[in-house]
Interface confidence: low
């Protein structure tokens, strides 16, 4: 670290005095201090001498000596006061520029440390400081306004009390610049606009920034529009608003509108689309298939997307049958608005019961008329099976009826022994019935099929099983011939003697 001679932190001299400051280091050294006249610099290897034989108040300041080759970057400093009774202040700069919330140093240096007790900061022409001005003073550096605000951009003077009267410095102009975080904030409303030809419309493009220096314009399909601008200042922000009013829109007015604002930080833009239509419209659609199949007991949400202008005057869900005259509960119907002209309507059908299969229609109305979208809901059921023994045309026949949805497939099994269900090891014969007879097949109902197995002689120590299956599940019925007739075994149920 370099060393300064005289080895004192502060030196007080009178005007006209000779001052010699010597700095010694291990390598070459350099002086740094306030720009002032009359100094002579003499360097000799590892030492440097700064001298004047006619010190003035302008030589007041802190002189720092550094050693450029020192990796630690050490330095030494001495503060020189040139105590001029006529000049209490040495002002190093007459204009100070800072950003808002930074500390602003007004560099008026006191030429006599004794005067420190009577210093103050004022605005020019003796005006007091603005309220909430928080400042401090250092005789070496001057006045510091802490966390300067834009409103504190003023002309200031430093005041010292000398012999009972206040002596002012020359003025220092403080410029506090707003911190511009980025391009202006933008809003363009509405985000989307639809109007019928001949209706009125309004599009508002507004931009705001902490700084007044920004531009904003509205453009239509890349053409800049000449719209008068309204300016305002509130909430510490400058606002510029462009309002486009159209009393009777036509198709030429349609298209893309962009609100663009720019400042030194860059450009922001936001867009909206304006659609002009010939007449009111109402479109219903669904991302779902209009024909729905759901397993009984499960839930289903039916969703309809509505695109409309003007807005809906009415809408509702209706059950069109065929099972009952019940109507969907309003609490199960839900509406959400995606944006101004698009809405989603949902009907929740939890734990579907057999009587809830059928047609569900969503109806909506606006000035363009009524529209409806109808869903067909069919319930899926696992097969239910029953077997009976009968004679058809004199032949003994096992008759299997299976009911379910989708239409069940039927398989007959013959196995040894008496059992509720044939397992692989017991199976003697298997017959697939590829075309069972359809007994009933009405919309929204189960499909009932019938399969016949002609048996010349019933083997008494055997079981005949009818199995039915579809995509939902399977069902079976075991028929056990006994000497007194025949026993049937519905799965996991009691024996039944017809």
């Amino acid at each position: 670290i370099p060393v300064i001679e005289p080895s004192v932190p502060e030196l007080v001299v009178k005007p006209g005095a000779t001052v010699t400051l010597r700095c010694v280091g291990n390598g070459s050294v350099e002086w740094d201090g306030p720009p002032s006249p009359h100094w002579t610099l003499y360097s000799d290897g590892s030492s440097s001498i700064l001298s004047t034989n006619n010190a003035t108040f302008q030589n007041t300041g802190t002189y720092r000596c550094t050693e450029p080759g020192d990796p630690l970057g050490g330095s030494a400093a001495i503060h020189l006061y040139v105590k001029d009774p006529a000049r209490p202040w040495n002002v190093l700069a007459q204009e100070v520029v800072v950003f808002e919330d930074q500390d602003a140093l007004l560099p008026c240096l006191l030429t006599d440390p004794v005067l420190e007790a009577g210093v103050s900061l004022v605005r020019v022409r003796g005006r007091p400081l603005m309220r909430h001005t928080n400042y401090s003073f250092s005789p070496w550096h001057g006045f510091t306004i802490h966390r300067a605000k834009f409103i504190q951009s003023q002309d200031y003077q430093c005041s010292a009390l000398m012999g009972g009267r206040k002596v002012m410095s020359i003025s220092i102009r403080l410029k506090v610049q707003k911190v511009i975080p980025g391009p202006p904030a933008l809003t363009l409303v509405p985000a989307e606009l639809v109007r019928i030809r001949g209706e009125a419309a309004q599009i508002v493009c507004s931009a705001s920034s902490v700084d007044v220096n920004f531009d904003v314009f509205l453009q239509h399909n890349n053409t800049k529009l000449a719209i008068p601008q309204q300016s305002d200042f509130h909430n510490n922000r400058y606002q510029k608003v462009l309002t486009l009013n159209l009393d009777q829109v036509d198709f030429q007015h349609a298209g893309n509108y962009s609100c663009v604002a720019s400042n030194v930080q860059g450009k922001h833009s936001t867009s909206m689309f304006f659609r002009v239509v010939e007449s009111a419209y109402l479109n219903l659609s669904s991302e779902q298939n209009l024909i729905q199949e759901v397993t009984v007991g499960e839930g289903l949400n039916l969703k309809v997307m509505v695109e409309a202008y003007p807005g809906l005057q009415g809408f509702n869900w209706t059950y069109l049958g065929p099972f009952s005259d019940h109507q969907p509960e309003p609490k199960l119907a839900n509406a959400t608005t995606k944006d101004t002209y698009r809405h989603t309507f949902t009907l929740s059908l939890p734990r579907l019961k057999p009587s809830e299969a059928g047609r569900y229609s969503f109806l909506a109305r606006n000035p363009g008329g009524w529209r409806a979208l109808t869903f067909e809901l069919t319930l899926r059921y696992p097969p239910e099976v029953s077997v009976i023994w009968t004679f058809i045309n004199g032949s003994g026949t096992l008759l299997c009826a299976a009911s379910g949805y989708p239409q069940p497939n039927v398989t007959w099994l013959q196995c040894s022994g008496h059992t509720d269900r044939c397992d692989e090891a017991q199976v003697l014969q298997v017959w697939d019935d590829p075309y069972p007879e359809v007994l009933s097949q009405e919309p929204f109902h189960k499909v009932t099929v019938q399969s016949l197995l002609t048996v010349e002689t019933l083997e008494h120590n055997q079981t005949y099983e009818c199995r039915a299956h579809n995509s939902v599940g399977s069902g079976s019925w075991a028929f056990i011939p006994i000497s007194a007739g025949a026993h049937t075994h519905p799965p996991d149920e009691f024996l039944f003697t017809p």
Partner: antibody, heavy 118, light 110 residues
């Protein structure tokens, strides 16, 4: 349906001021640019200038020193004054509604012939 | 002398296709929309084409507009006797800060 109707003297003496008024009916004067356009006999169209309903104006540079366009929103009217006229200012004068693309004149008056002659 | 240049006359027979050109510069046609106006004899001009190629409602689709660089053109297909009129192109001029018109083209249907 918006309609525009020009009115004013059909004969003006040289060096005097030509004054015309355009009355807008069937629609508001607000939100549009209102222009004056003229057509000398047997010649093409020449744009004179426009006024926005707020009062801001823009004039053809070649006529700027002699033109004043004003607006009276309460009467739904706008007016043209052309000073120091000469025979070269003899023309059919049209008023027109311009949308804010400025060149988009969707409604025109039927035009009024102004002759400059002593 | 008009800022936009149009041929003074054009002609065609009924059913024909006729094109009218309009030439300008980078400060008008080059950077702004072109508009076309039709002026039937003894009447006020009527907007025919807006924004280079948009037809206002009521204008037949026989009329079409296009723009390329600093030039624009109006095409009329299936020419009819009622199309006989003067046609003017117009554009905003950035350097003059005003509307400029072409000198007009007189269309004759032979």
């Amino acid at each position: 349906q918006v309609q525009l109707q020009e009115s004013g003297p059909g004969l003006v003496k040289p060096s005097e001021t030509l004054s015309l008024t355009c009355t807008v009916s069937g629609g508001s004067i607000s939100s549009y640019y209102w222009s004056w356009i003229r057509q000398p006999p047997g010649k093409g169209l020449e744009w004179i200038g426009y006024i926005y309903y707020t009062g801001s104006t823009n004039y053809n540079p070649s006529l700027k020193s002699r033109v004043t366009i004003s607006v009276d929103t309460s009467k739904n009217q706008f007016s043209l004054k052309l000073s120091s006229v000469t025979a070269a200012d003899t023309a059919v004068y049209y008023c027109a509604r311009g949308w804010w693309e400025l060149t988009f004149f969707d409604y025109w008056g039927q035009g009024t012939l102004v002759t400059v002659s002593s | 002398q008009s800022v936009l240049t149009q041929p003074p006359s054009a002609s065609g027979t009924p059913g024909q296709r006729v094109t009218i050109s309009c030439s300008g510069s980078s400060s008008n046609i080059g950077s702004n929309y072109v508009y076309w106006y039709q002026q039937l004899p003894g009447t006020a001009p009527k907007l025919l084409i807006s924004s280079n190629n948009q037809r206002p409602s009521g204008v037949p689709d026989r009329f079409s507009g296009s723009k390329s660089g600093t030039s624009a053109s109006l095409a009329i297909s299936g020419l009819r006797s009622e199309d006989e009129a003067d046609y003017y192109c117009a554009a905003w001029d950035d350097s003059l800060s005003g509307v400029v018109f072409g000198g007009g083209t007189k269309l004759t249907v032979l």
